[in-house]
Interface confidence: low
């Protein structure tokens, strides 16, 4: 009975240096990504960033809130959490992609229209799990519905066709605050990842019973971080085998 | 508040013509596409025709084609239905109708309901 | 064409009731399906858009379902007020087309 005890005890504590191995391995590893990053970026030490700041750089939208709020989670969590070894789980990455300005996307008075996405390399079309097009959509005074509408530009065609449609959603809005509204935009996303030319952009339209557009696409006064943008989430299967 | 008052009906002997006038107020009038609707006397509601905005997209019933022309009035606030070779069965109170959207927006085939009528104006063909 | 066949043709209902109108589209029109009520002497009115969407100002006792091909209309308690017509209508295509209609009466 005795020597059970003590053969548990033996294997309990190999499992444990396991353990404090594999975890001081996996903290050298990120300590050193963490140089890599900070010398390409020719910083000395971490830019000390808030919260608050993050909040007033990125775009005030529910998918964003939820990731600073989760990141804060995990930050303040002590490290007695469960540790998941990574190299053996396909994780989900989210991307944001904010709106770049492009020569195809200009109307005839030289103002430019919204909006046009250029795509990290991450984002390839079979790992695509969700692609979302999120737009903020200004106050009414008095209730309406209002028309959404997400166009899809195309090279023009022989009938002088420029672009086709993405999304059309109608939606009742009272008078109060504004709204973010998300449209699913997976399917236009793994066509623009197989074909990168056909990506000439999309024109965002949002009106209400009298016709003003309620969509922000070029941010006015009082109007930052209000810009649309995609959310987009990707699967990274992993490479390695369990050894 | 969104109002149509439709004029013009009365009775006409067939083969005759007549203009039908729907004068809209209370909403940006160019915006919106319209539609002639009519119902027979104790009958059910038929679509006759649909105009977009501009005035430059305009469909038509089969039973009709041909004989109705739709147009409109930006400037004046007013759709109309021009009606040539009428016949017995052209009787029927005509509504003039605003679509629910505004037409800048392209809805890739389906047309969208409406969601103002005026009080329809009768029209009897009949010798 | 599209043809929308509704049923019934008619019904009596007393106040209170829950009434339940159907109409089917002869092919698939997703959801792009709305209802109208008609008083007599008047005319037609939109409560429902897009199947299942009510028209502002509408009463919530008033509602809409289905797509594809199958719809349904109901009103949860029928009131005086709701003694009308009733008619189903595409527009998935034109020529836009209506159903039949269903007469609504109090018992």
């Known amino acids: 009975n005795e020597n059970s005890e003590q053969k548990e005890n033996v294997e309990k504590e190999g499992l444990c240096n396991a353990c404090t191995w594999r975890q001081n391995t996996k903290s050298s590893r990120i300590e050193a990504i963490k140089i890599q990053i900070l010398s390409k970026l020719r910083l000395e030490t971490a830019p000390n960033i808030s919260k608050d700041v993050i909040r007033q750089l990125l775009p005030k939208a529910p998918p964003l809130r939820e990731l600073i709020d989760q990141y804060d989670v995990q930050r303040d969590d002590s490290s007695d959490g469960s540790l998941e070894d990574d190299d053996y789980h396909a994780t989900t990455e989210t991307i944001i992609t904010m709106p770049t300005e492009s020569d195809f996307l200009m109307q005839v008075d030289g103002k430019p229209k919204c909006c046009f996405f250029k795509f990290s390399s991450k984002i390839q079309y079979n790992k695509v799990v969700k692609a979302q097009l999120w737009i903020y959509l200004r106050p009414v005074e008095t209730p309406t519905t209002v028309f959404v509408q997400i166009l899809r530009l195309i090279k023009p065609m022989k009938d002088g066709t420029r672009y086709t449609g993405i999304r059309s959603l109608k939606l009742d809005m009272n008078p109060g605050t504004g709204i973010w509204q998300s449209i699913d935009v997976k399917t236009v996303l793994q066509n623009w990842l197989k074909q990168p030319e056909s990506n000439l952009g999309i024109e965002i339209k949002a009106l209400d019973e009298n016709g003003h557009d309620l969509a922000v696409t070029f941010p006015g006064p009082g109007e930052d971080g209000l810009n649309p943008f995609l959310e987009v989430k990707v699967t990274d299967t992993p490479k390695r085998s369990r050894r | 508040e969104v109002q149509l008052v439709e004029s013009g009906g009365g009775l006409v002997q067939p083969g005759g013509s007549l203009r039908l006038s729907c004068t809209a107020s209370?909403?940006?009038?160019?915006?919106?596409?319209m539609d002639w609707v009519r119902q027979a006397p104790g009958k059910g509601l038929e679509w006759v025709s649909y105009?977009?905005?501009?005035?430059?997209?305009?469909y038509y019933a089969d039973s009709v084609k041909g004989r109705f022309t739709i147009s409109r009035d930006n400037a004046k606030n007013t759709l109309y239905l021009q009606m040539n070779s009428l016949r017995a069965e052209d009787t029927a109170v005509y509504y003039c109708?605003?679509?629910?959207?505004?037409?800048?927006?392209?809805?890739?085939?389906?047309?969208?309901?409406?969601?103002?009528w005026g009080q329809g104006t009768l029209v009897t063909v009949s010798s | 064409d599209i043809q929308m066949t509704q049923s019934p043709s008619s019904l009596s209902a007393s106040v209170g009731d829950r009434v339940t109108i159907t109409c089917q589209a002869s092919?698939?029109?997703?959801?792009?399906l709305n209802w109208y009520q008609q008083k007599p002497g008047k005319a037609p009115k939109l409560l429902i858009y897009?199947?299942?969407n009510l028209q502002r100002g509408v009463p919530s006792r008033f509602s809409g379902s289905g797509s594809g091909t199958d719809f349904t209309f109901t009103i949860s308690s029928l009131q005086p007020e709701d003694i009308a017509t009733y008619y189903c209508?595409?527009?998935?295509?034109?020529?836009?087309?209506f159903g039949g209609g269903t007469k609504v009466e109090i018992k």
């Open positions: 109708a605003k679509v629910q959207s505004p037409s800048e927006l392209l809805w890739f085939g389906e047309l969208l309901p409406v969601d103002y």
């Open positions: 209508q595409q527009s998935a295509s034109t020529p836009i087309t």
């Open positions: 092919q698939v029109i997703k959801t792009w």
């Open positions: 897009d199947a299942s």
């Open positions: 105009i977009s905005g501009r005035g430059d997209v305009t």
């Open positions: 209370g909403f940006t009038f160019g915006s919106y596409p």
